[in-house]
Amino acid sequence: RKIPKVGHTFFQKPESCPPVPGGSMKLDIGIINENQRVSMSRNIESRSTSPWNYTVTWDPNRYPSEVVQAQCRNLGCINAQGKEDISMNSVPIQQETLVVRRKHQGCSVSFQLEKVLVTVGCTCVTPVIHHVQ
Amino acid sequence: GITIPRNPGCPNSEDKNFPRTVMVNLNIHNRNTNTNPKRSSDYYNRSTSPWNLHRNEDPERYPSVIWEAKCRHLGCINADGNVDYHMNSVPIQQEILVLRREPPHCPNSFRLEKILVSVGCTCVTPIVHHVA
């Protein structure tokens, strides 16, 4: 079945729901689990056979303002000798996240939810080889 | 909060930070991008650190379906197609923001929630500790 739109649900609407103008929704941006920390293995971005670098993008009209993006360092993968092997490919792994975009129209301000595609890291894959007929 | 540059001609009462609660348009920008990683690429099968994708569904959350990656092996697949334990498959994790219905079951009232997801796996050189 289709995933329902954000504003729709299979549940009965409880009496306690706050009133919301049509075409919009109420969003509390006080983040649940704000202080949880990623416990990823130590410096895997450097130890990976498909290593990557991080860059921070900053946008004051976005919440959160900082979004970290990864970029694969190589086209190929690093072999046991520490050399780049171009018979394999380093490829980005991506994940969608939500952000709140603040838009200024004259002196009025509106807010829009936006899906952003974040590159999280890289993995080493066997290439798909296309043979010419 | 986050400081916002203001139009100099606007009244000074405008808050520079994002308010705690905002009304947002129901239409999500870029909402129709492909959210099924199995359809978007086959990296999970072609990787030297392949992973399985597990569907996590929660109707109280948007998006209601999130795919969790679990590394198939502890080692990595070598050039011979064998799993080699001299290298390690590890998950790549990412914090993402989702919407949580608050109060529960309410159709148009949400709160942002930060969740940790494993997106895929990568092959790393292990840190080996020998016993003295």
Epitope: S41 | C71, R72, L74, V90, V124, V131
Partner: antibody, heavy 120, light 111 residues
Framework: QVQLKESGPGLVAPSQSLSITCTIS????????VHWVRQPPGKGLEWLVV???????TYNSALKSRLSITRDNSKSQVFLKMNSLQTDDTAIYYC??????????????WGQGTPVTVSS | DVVMTQTPLSLPVSLGDQASISCRSS???????????LHWYLQKPGQSPKLLIY???NRFSGVPDRFSGSGSGTDFTLKISRVEAEDLGVYFC????????FGGGTKLEIK
């Protein structure tokens, strides 16, 4: 429920090869790995080889040149072939399921074992 | 390969006593993903091994809570709080962080 059953020749002549079959039920070979482990009489356990859910394999490096593991998903069977047997290969040979899908990475269910004697 | 050393080789106990078995590895068993893949099995006479504990301290389904596992890095312990007759047999530790290896076994027997 999960079951594994080994079947083998029982007796093998020195320098000959050994073929053993593990027939499984209650799970799928495309979701779980299968290991072979052996136990010489009165001794401990020695891990031999595993075939993973995706068909990849890992071998005991000391025995790799003598071992081969294959499977037939449609028949729910895993096959072990071992070449150049000597008397010290006499053991009970077990197949065991790897808890791959639960991500414990250990052998959670074992067959009852098949005894193999290497003797002329 | 990683060498697993179990002590003692033989452990005579009285029923109702606590038993403790040690297992030491030649390398750390902490995987790059942060988990430790150290497991315990019991092999009763004439039977195949049965999984008791996985990943150091997690009891496998159906295993009584008198069995507990602990340890980290290279040193691990299996404890049986009150030994029962059905607990007798050979206990093996095993690791799967590196390519699979087993300890030599500890025989739990009646004093």
């Amino acid at each position: 429920q999960v079951q594994l059953k080994e079947s083998g020749p029982g007796l093998v002549a020195p320098s000959q090869s050994l073929s053993i079959t593990c027939t499984i039920s209650g799970f799928s070979l495309t979701s779980y790995g299968v290991h072979w482990v052996r136990q010489p009489p009165g001794k401990g356990l020695e891990w031999l080889v595993v075939i993973w859910s995706d068909g990849t394999t890992t071998y005991n490096s000391a025995l790799k040149s003598r071992l081969s593991i294959t499977r037939d998903n449609s028949k729910s069977q895993v096959f072990l072939k071992m070449n150049s047997l000597q008397t010290d290969d006499t053991a009970i040979y077990y197949c065991a399921r790897d808890s791959t899908w639960d991500y414990y990475y250990t052998m959670d269910y074992w067959g009852q074992g098949t005894p193999v004697t290497v003797s002329s | 390969d990683v060498v697993m050393t179990q002590t003692p080789l033989s452990l005579p106990v009285s029923l109702g006593d606590q038993a403790s078995i040690s297992c030491r590895s030649s390398q750390s068993l902490v995987h790059s993903n942060g988990n430790t893949y150290l497991h315990w099995y019991l092999q009763k006479p004439g039977q195949s091994p049965k999984l008791l504990i996985y990943k150091v301290s997690n009891r496998f389904s159906g295993v009584p809570d008198r069995f507990s596992g602990s340890g980290s890095g290279t040193d691990f312990t299996l404890k049986i709080s009150r030994v029962e007759a059905e607990d007798l047999g050979v206990y093996f530790c095993s690791q799967s962080t590196h390519v699979y290896t087993f300890g030599g076994g500890t025989k739990l027997e009646i004093k």
